[in-house]
């Protein structure tokens, strides 16, 4: 292992949201038998470029009159996709994004798919199932996640810079061992992503290797670098 080398310590991106091609797990809810039917709202982080499937409430087709998906995306008019069972008619209003579609024909499957998920798909999605006795709702606050690109380099004598570039939401950076760190800098991009930069200095020569740990909803990443022992020498590693 050469001096001043940058090593990927863990790229174990622990995807708790490993596959978004299945519907979100059902939440614990208790339905009562009144006409006021429960509305379930779920916050759901989804990784960009994956396939996401959003589900309606568990109402069988035989009990339905109309299935409606309402899609509210930032800065766009509300899009509505609906299917009326009696007439076998599908209708769309203000829906322009071709990546958001029914999984199948609505009479076969009422689920909605986003393929692939883009950063612009942040928003609120609601399935409304109309039955003869009232409506059932299931809503999703979809938060699109973007994995940041992590870089680590020694900028000058025993000072390291760790960057988590263009992540969504902002990543968190920590160091092992702790150094003398400048306040973390954040740069916001127009598309909703954030670059986080942390700069730290280690005065004592007893510290030879430092690790930058980046925590993010899409998974954690740690990089380490060997600090140059000789003052004045400047080298970066990839």
């Amino acid at each position: 292992q050469s001096n001043n080398s940058l090593m990927l310590q863990t790229s174990k991106e622990n995807h708790t949201l490993a596959s978004n091609s299945l519907c979100m797990d059902e939440k614990q809810i208790t339905q009562n038998h009144s006409k006021v039917l429960a509305e379930v709202n779920i916050s759901w982080p989804v990784q960009m470029a994956r396939n996401a499937v959003l589900c309606c409430p568990p109402i069988e087709f035989r009990n339905l009159i109309v299935i409606t998906w309402e899609i509210i995306l930032r800065g766009q008019p509300s899009c509505t996709k609906s299917y009326r069972k009696e007439t076998n008619e599908t209708k769309e209003t203000n829906c322009t994004d071709e990546r958001i579609t029914w999984v199948s024909t609505p009479d076969q499957n009422s689920d909605l798919q986003i393929h692939p998920v883009a950063i612009t798909h942040d928003g609120y999605y609601r399935c409304i199932m109309a039955t003869p006795d009232g409506n059932f709702h299931r809503g999703y606050h979809l938060q699109v996640l973007v994995t940041p690109e992590v870089t680590l380099f020694e900028s000058r004598n025993r000072t390291a810079v760790c960057k988590a570039v263009a992540g969504k939401p902002a990543a968190q950076i920590s160091w092992i061992p702790a150094g003398d760190c400048a306040p973390t800098e954040q740069e916001y991009w127009g598309n909703g992503t954030v670059t986080v930069k942390s700069t730290c200095h280690w005065e004592g020569h007893n510290v030879s290797t430092v690790t930058c740990h980046v925590s993010h909803l899409t998974g954690n990443k740690s990089l380490y670098i060997e600090l140059l022992p000789v003052p004045g020498a400047k080298k970066s590693a990839k």
Epitope: L22, E26, Q31, P57, P58, N63, D133
Partner: antibody, heavy 119, light 111 residues
Framework: EVQLQQSGPELVKPGASVKMSCKAS????????MHWVKQKPGQGLEWIGY????????KHNEKFKDKATLTSAKSSSTVYMELSSLTSEDSAVYYC????????????WGQGTLVTVSA | DIVLTQSPASLAVSLGQRATISCRAS??????????LHWYQQKPGQPPKLLIY???NLESGVPARFSGSGSGTDFTLNIHPVEEEDAATYYC?????????FGGGTKLEIK
């Protein structure tokens, strides 16, 4: 209050037919699917089929396709099941049960109709 | 058709203890993010009574000592603490597609 009232016990001869009823009250009859379930003495439950009174949509368990005929009468809020060509294997308690929208569960059941097939 | 296998066929549990009943499906009962697996209690001479729906949701009016868990193909009904009135036969049911099917039943006896 939702109630499903089933007709009384029947003693019938082999080869004959029997028609039992399930009268619904306490809700809009045509809004909910009604299912029928069989339970032989000391045994488990077996799904027979359903009828949707709204449009008379009917689905059967293949096993009961030629055995059970399901009908409904909107005017009296009643569903019926007729069993034909009876044998001792048809001796059982028959339940009607209303399907709830959410999860297709059976939250309301009739008290059951006992059918005894005997010579 | 999905086959539901319940175990044990019968069990005896002391008052106040935990009763655990298992239901295994021949294939996954999960459809569109939901497990269409319900639990019923039946006492002699009575119709079944719904306890748990969609694997883990307690039906209105059912005591909180009843709970359901599981996903995919393996499901469990737990009763804790068991009371005298819980002596009954318990059935799991699948309702995700036709035909609906029931497990063979588990008879619970209170010691």
């Amino acid at each position: 209050e939702v109630q499903l009232q089933q007709s009384g016990p029947e003693l019938v001869k082999p080869g004959a037919s029997v028609k039992m009823s399930c009268k619904a009250s306490g809700y809009t009859f045509t809004s909910y699917v009604m299912h029928w379930v069989k339970q032989k003495p000391g045994q488990g439950l077996e799904w027979i089929g359903y009828i949707h009174p709204y449009n008379d949509d009917i689905k059967h368990n293949e096993k009961f396709k030629d055995k059970a005929t399901l009908t409904s009468a909107k005017s009296s809020s009643t569903v019926y099941m007729e069993l034909s060509s009876l044998t001792s294997e048809d001796s059982a308690v028959y339940y009607c049960a209303r399907e709830e929208y959410y999860g297709s569960r059976f939250a309301y059941w009739g008290q059951g109709t006992l059918v005894t097939v005997s010579a | 058709d999905i086959v539901l296998t319940q175990s044990p066929a019968s069990l005896a549990v002391s008052l106040g203890q935990r009763a655990t009943i298992s239901c295994r499906a021949s294939k996954s009962v999960r459809t569109s993010g939901y497990s269409y697996l319900h639990w019923y209690q039946q006492k002699p001479g009575q119709p079944p009574k719904l306890l748990i729906y969609l694997a883990s949701n307690l039906e209105s009016g059912v005591p909180a000592r009843f709970s359901g868990s599981g996903s995919g193909t393996d499901f469990t009904l737990n009763i804790h603490p068991v009371e005298e009135e819980d002596a009954a036969t318990y059935y799991c049911q699948y309702s995700g597609e036709l035909p609906f099917t029931f497990g063979g039943g588990t008879k619970l006896e209170i010691k």
